[in-house]
């Protein structure tokens, strides 16, 4: 899977939209590595 910063950001945005936009403080691109996906 793509693990560039941009890919991580877009994947996280997708997860957030599917979860209804629930955001935890640590659930941001700069804190979430590619392994989280």
């Amino acid at each position: 899977a793509c693990d560039t910063a941009t890919c991580v950001t877009h994947r996280l945005a997708g997860l957030l939209s599917r979860s209804g936009g629930v955001v935890k403080n640590n659930f941001v691109p700069t804190n979430v590595g590619s392994k989280a996906f």
Partner: antibody
């Protein structure tokens, strides 16, 4: 409103260094990666590198490795791009850019900083 | 580095025309492609990410498609404000790379 505001135009001599700043507002600066891209006159866009403002971890285009240095000042929500050993081919507009998810999912770019390298 | 080859380099079109721009990657980049619009003296403006998703506020006349190595940006009905240069970008692997641009000019 998300904004990326860059420092003003610079004129430098060959061999000198330049440091461009990018002040972010309207979002949590440390949450999103900051990219730096340049565009020489009449040329395609060229990616320089990115930085994780939270950790300071950087990834560079090998073409610029050793000459470009990306840093951040978290307290000032500002990113910096320093380019050393300037040559005439470095004459370009330099942009900072960041893909933000909250408050708006969008790819925001600074207004650009013109760097002219001339003897 | 992955090469992104755009075609055509320029296209002359009229308001209302359908315009198609293609971008070919030198290797598989999945769907990790973005499209940007740039007007003279201005910063690039993001249009499309993940090959086919429009950013919020981007008019529906802009659409993207493709995966792997072949990608397309289509403007279904060209408007006066669409005359600009368009760039594709791959972000599947470092370094990110851009196409050479397609200038959409008034016929």
């Amino acid at each position: 409103e998300v904004q990326l505001v860059q420092s003003g135009a610079e004129v430098k001599k060959p061999g000198a260094s330049v440091k461009v700043s990018c002040k972010a507002s309207g979002y949590t600066f440390t949450d999103y990666y900051m990219n730096w891209v340049r565009q020489a006159p009449g040329q395609r866009l060229e990616w320089i590198g990115d930085i994780n403002p939270n950790s300071g971890v950087t990834t560079y285009n090998q073409k610029f490795k050793g000459r470009a240095t990306l840093t951040v000042d978290k307290s000032a929500s500002t990113a910096y791009m320093e380019l050393s050993s300037l040559r005439s081919e470095d004459t370009a507009v330099y942009y900072c850019a960041s893909i933000i998810i909250v408050p708006d999912y969008f790819d925001y770019w600074g207004q650009g900083t013109t760097v002219t390298v001339s003897s | 580095d992955i090469q992104m080859t755009q075609s055509p380099s320029s296209v002359s079109a009229s308001v209302g025309d359908r315009v198609t721009i293609t971008c070919k990657a030198s290797q598989n980049v999945g769907s990790n492609v973005a499209w940007y619009q740039q007007k003279p003296g201005k910063s690039p403006k993001a249009l499309i990410y993940s090959a086919s998703y429009r950013y919020s506020g981007v008019p529906s006349r802009f659409s993207g498609s493709g995966s792997g190595t072949d990608f397309t940006l289509t403007i279904s009905s060209l408007q006066p404000e669409d005359f600009a240069t368009y760039y594709c970008q791959q972000y599947n692997s470092y370094p990110y790379t851009f196409g050479g641009g397609t200038k959409v000019e008034i016929k």
